[in-house]
């Protein structure tokens, strides 16, 4: 092992102050002991040590602690989890949520990096679920963190934790997180009436099966035409002209804008051209009248 | 015991010059960054000057730049202050302290008077 | 015009709890540790708080420090006659790189 060079006479540190920013990094390594450091951890962020002395900090923290830090250290970091390596996080076992919120205050307004991804993997699986509380910190920090976990994360979110999901969270979730996600805001939401239902599930719709929409369209709605285009295109296709009608309300005349793009077009072609000349909007690409229209999937089913 | 003793102060005409020193005691000086503290009579604090322990960088207030030094002697466990060009708005006591983030020990102050 | 800034005075009655607001940047306590002093009538101010909420030894404590964003407290709670001071807060500012105090604020006791 290489000798450590001795602290010089007089300036062993008796405490973590503001003095040790003068010391050099090797003053550092030789005078400061690893467990006053651990034990005044608290003060670290207060004082504005350059990032090769906290290098030295973090260094004599890891001797200390090999096996990963304990929670009381942890959550006191501060600046000084930014020197953490996703190695270094998964030693950890980060239990209480005040911790999580310490940590990820440090990163806040920086996107969402490997080290804080791994503490909230960490942090979550020591849970085993996704509890309203943790979810309302991390989507408080990160807006997107709900749409970054696998559909197989998401079924650890229980139906409670919905009532803290914001639309905005829900912005880049793909279909099939939405149709693990739908279900439990539905059965979050069951008790509500019809109107604060709807305000409710409008962002969790995009999971929603053909049933569910030909249920909400009998409730006057009024869906826009952004939640629409949203919708699953295989859920959308079976309705009606008058059920989308219904669906949409005042909104229907939005259909004419969106009549290339998807559901909407897909849609289209499944409809009867007269039926979609009751909207009176003008849509082009219906069945003919006359035509007779097989339902494949249904005389599959029967074979 | 952590004490410090200021002296040097006293009544000046304005342009004039004066020193002002800090002897310190009961810690390790040469370990500790060391600042300067005024305060106007009837007025609030105002930090004038701060120099870390090697004398590497100094630091001063707007108001008193180009005007005062500030060094420090670690052999003597002292702190100075070099004021020239004073003016009548530095009539103030001034205060020696220890660090220079926190303030946790300070003289008991010296009064200068700029005046004609 | 100091660059920390304070109410001018605070009251209350023994027993009572005061609090004490001091406003910054972020380039100030947005970023950097606040401090708190005390300074009895015609004595050198002494450290009350420290590292936004720290008590150095020998100060009670019903004295108390806080810090959030760019702004932080000082609570005196249990109000006693001999809380009436001066009441400064400080903290280093790395834009004009030197420290700044805020413009004080004497506590009444009634």
């Known amino acids: 092992e290489v000798e450590k060079t001795a602290c010089p006479s007089g300036k062993k540190a008796r405490e973590i102050d503001e003095s040790l920013i003068f010391y050099k990094k090797w003053e550092l390594e030789a005078c400061v002991d690893a467990a006053l450091l651990a034990t005044q951890m608290d003060r670290v962020n207060a004082i504005p040590f350059t990032y090769e002395q906290l290098d030295v900090l973090k260094h004599k923290l890891d001797e200390l602690y090999p096996q990963g830090y304990p929670e009381s250290v942890i959550q006191h970091l501060g600046y000084l989890f930014l020197k953490m390596s996703p190695e270094d996080i998964r030693k950890w076992n980060v239990t209480s949520l005040e911790t999580l919120k310490a940590l990820l205050e440090v990163n806040k307004g920086h996107e969402m990096s490997p080290q804080v991804a791994t503490l909230i993997d960490r942090f979550v699986k020591g849970r085993g679920q996704l509890d309203k509380d943790t979810l309302d910190t991390l989507t408080a920090f990160y807006p997107g963190y709900l749409c970054s976990l696998s559909p197989e994360e998401l079924s650890s979110v229980p139906p409670s934790s919905i009532w803290a999901v914001r639309p905005q969270d829900l912005d880049t979730c793909d279909p099939r997180q939405l149709d693990v996600l739908y279900p439990k805001a539905r059965l979050a939401f069951q008790n509500m009436n019809g109107s604060e239902y709807f305000v409710k599930i409008q962002s969790f719709l995009g999971g929603a099966p053909t049933e569910d929409l030909k249920a909400l369209s009998q409730q006057n709605v009024s869906m826009d035409l952004a939640t629409f285009m949203k919708l699953r295109t295989d859920a959308v296709l079976p309705l009606t002209v008058a059920e989308v009608q219904k669906l949409l309300g005042p909104h229907v005349e939005g259909l004419k804008a969106e009549e290339r793009h998807r559901p909407v077009r897909d849609w289209i072609l499944r409809q009867r051209q007269d039926d979609l000349d009751t909207l009176g909007l003008g849509l082009q690409g219906g069945i003919p009248n006359g035509y007779l229209v097989l339902d494949l999937s249904m005389q599959e089913a029967l074979s | 015991e952590v004490q410090l003793l200021e002296s040097g102060g006293g009544l000046v005409q304005p342009g004039g010059s004066l020193r002002l020193s800090c002897a310190a005691s009961?810690?390790?000086?040469?370990?500790?960054?060391m600042s300067w503290v005024r305060q106007a009579p009837g007025k609030g604090l105002e930090w004038v000057s701060g120099i870390p322990p090697d004398s590497g960088s100094k630091y001063y207030a707007d108001s008193v730049r180009g005007r005062f030094t500030v060094s420090r002697d670690n052999s003597k466990n002292t702190l100075y202050l070099q004021m020239n060009s004073l003016r009548a708005e530095d009539t103030a006591v001034y205060y020696c302290?220890?660090?220079?983030?926190?303030?946790?020990?300070w003289g008991q102050g010296t009064l200068v008077t700029v005046s004609s | 015009q100091s660059v920390l800034t304070q109410p001018p005075s605070a009251s209350g009655t023994p027993g009572q709890r005061v609090t004490i607001s001091c406003t910054g940047s972020?380039?100030?306590?947005?970023?950097?540790?606040v401090s708190w002093y005390q300074q009895l009538p015609g004595t050198a101010p002494k450290l009350l708080i420290y590292y936004n909420s720290k008590r150095p030894s020998g100060v009670p404590d019903r004295f108390s420090g806080s810090k959030s964003g760019t702004s932080a407290s000082l609570a005196i709670s249990g109000l006693r006659s001999e809380d009436e001071a001066d009441y400064y807060c400080?903290?280093?500012?790395?834009?004009?790189?030197?420290?700044?105090f805020g413009g004080g604020t004497k506590v009444t006791v009634l």
């Open positions: 009961g810690f390790t000086f040469s370990n500790y960054a």
């Open positions: 400080g903290s280093w500012d790395s834009s004009l790189n030197g420290y700044v």
């Open positions: 302290a220890k660090n220079m983030l926190s303030f946790d020990y």
């Open positions: 972020s380039s100030n306590i947005g970023s950097n540790a």
